[in-house]
């Protein structure tokens, strides 16, 4: 399955939108920094078959979509930007879902992939728990926004590696 070029552009657009969503100066939030333990190894395309990598990407985008679709998220961000951001993520999910169906038919996805998806889910659980502990404060959301920008950048790099493998 070849992800369309529009998928990469969508990922870039999502990153730009997320970058524009900030409402407060991040300089006031330095002491709120937190180690979410991003599962970097899951974004290393070299160790995965293509089907696995696409499944990990799908989970990453799905969890990001879920995080920014909550009521608390709606209260935190400017509505039109949030809607555009969610639309970009939704389009990416559609692209990836088509690929997941196609690729899983070609390759049997081993248990290792379940571990990778679980690692991504646990990562987002840590992010959600942080937001709860910080009572969804503006700084907590600002830290999470920075973290998601970082993880989306990793996703973009994984997609680039996948295209080079084709």
């Amino acid at each position: 399955c070849d992800l369309p070029q529009t998928h990469s552009l969508g990922n870039r657009r999502a990153l730009i939108l997320l970058g524009q969503m900030g409402r407060i100066s991040p300089f006031s939030c330095l002491k709120d920094r937190h180690d979410f333990r991003i599962p970097q190894e899951e974004f290393d395309g070299n160790q995965f078959q293509k089907a696995q990598a696409i499944s990990v990407l799908h989970e990453m985008i799905q969890q990001t979509f879920n995080l920014f679709s909550t009521e608390d998220s709606s209260a935190a961000w400017e509505q039109s930007l949030l809607e555009k951001f969610s639309t970009e993520l939704y389009q990416q999910l559609n692209d990836l879902e088509a690929c997941v169906i196609q690729e899983v038919g070609v390759e049997e996805t081993p248990l290792m992939n379940e571990d990778s998806i679980l690692a991504v889910r646990k990562y987002f659980q840590r992010i959600t728990l942080y937001l709860i502990e910080r009572k969804y404060s503006p700084c907590a959301w600002e830290v999470v926004r920075a973290e998601i920008m970082r993880s989306l950048s990793f996703s973009t790099n994984l997609q680039k590696r996948l295209r080079r493998k084709d």
Epitope: G19, G22, P26, L30, R33, D35, A146, E147, R150, S153
Partner: antibody
Amino acid sequence: EVQLVQSGAEVKKPGESLKISCKGSGYSFTSYWIGWVRQMPGKGLEWMGIIDPSDSDTAYSPSFQGQVTISADKSISTAYLQWSSLKASDTAMYYCARHPGLNWAPDFDYWGQGTLVTVSS
Amino acid sequence: DIQMTQSPSSLSASVGDRVTITCRASQSIDGALNWYQQKPGKAPKLLIYFASSLQSGVPSRFSGSGSGTDFTLTISSLQPEDFATYYCQQSFDFPLTFGQGTKVEIK
């Protein structure tokens, strides 16, 4: 390879203006903040201020607020430090360094080579 | 502002010695402390971040510990290339502040 390359040494007279630069390469320039640090001859390190190149938001140390201006041009991946009226006490080595912002990652992990500014009549 | 106080301001040691430098913050900074090494005429180099994480490429003889207000940089076995000035820096809040430095000289 991540690199921060600073402009060359400057010799200026008191009252003159100056703008020194720091060009980033090998990484996404807008994903990191750029900080500026002063080191006067034979002295320690002093943090001056920082900029987020993605939107040019800045923060300054109270000691340097109003004395210098930090700016950035993300289109050419370059941050700047400028003075409108130099004093002899501005004579120092100035370093730029990248900062991960709100991400949990090493602070000031890459530094420029430094720009020596000499102010003398 | 958060004041950072290093001790000692200088020390003399021999190759192979275990060297300890301390840094105290004027208020709690959790674990938001970095250590840098600077050699004459060179830019500082990050050694340790978030109090105890070893920066990539830094030899394992360097280690950091502490949290709250008291922090330590330890060089387990001093090497000839370790003679330099060491700075701590808090990254807990703005304005960021450095310690005054500790110069490690050859005995």
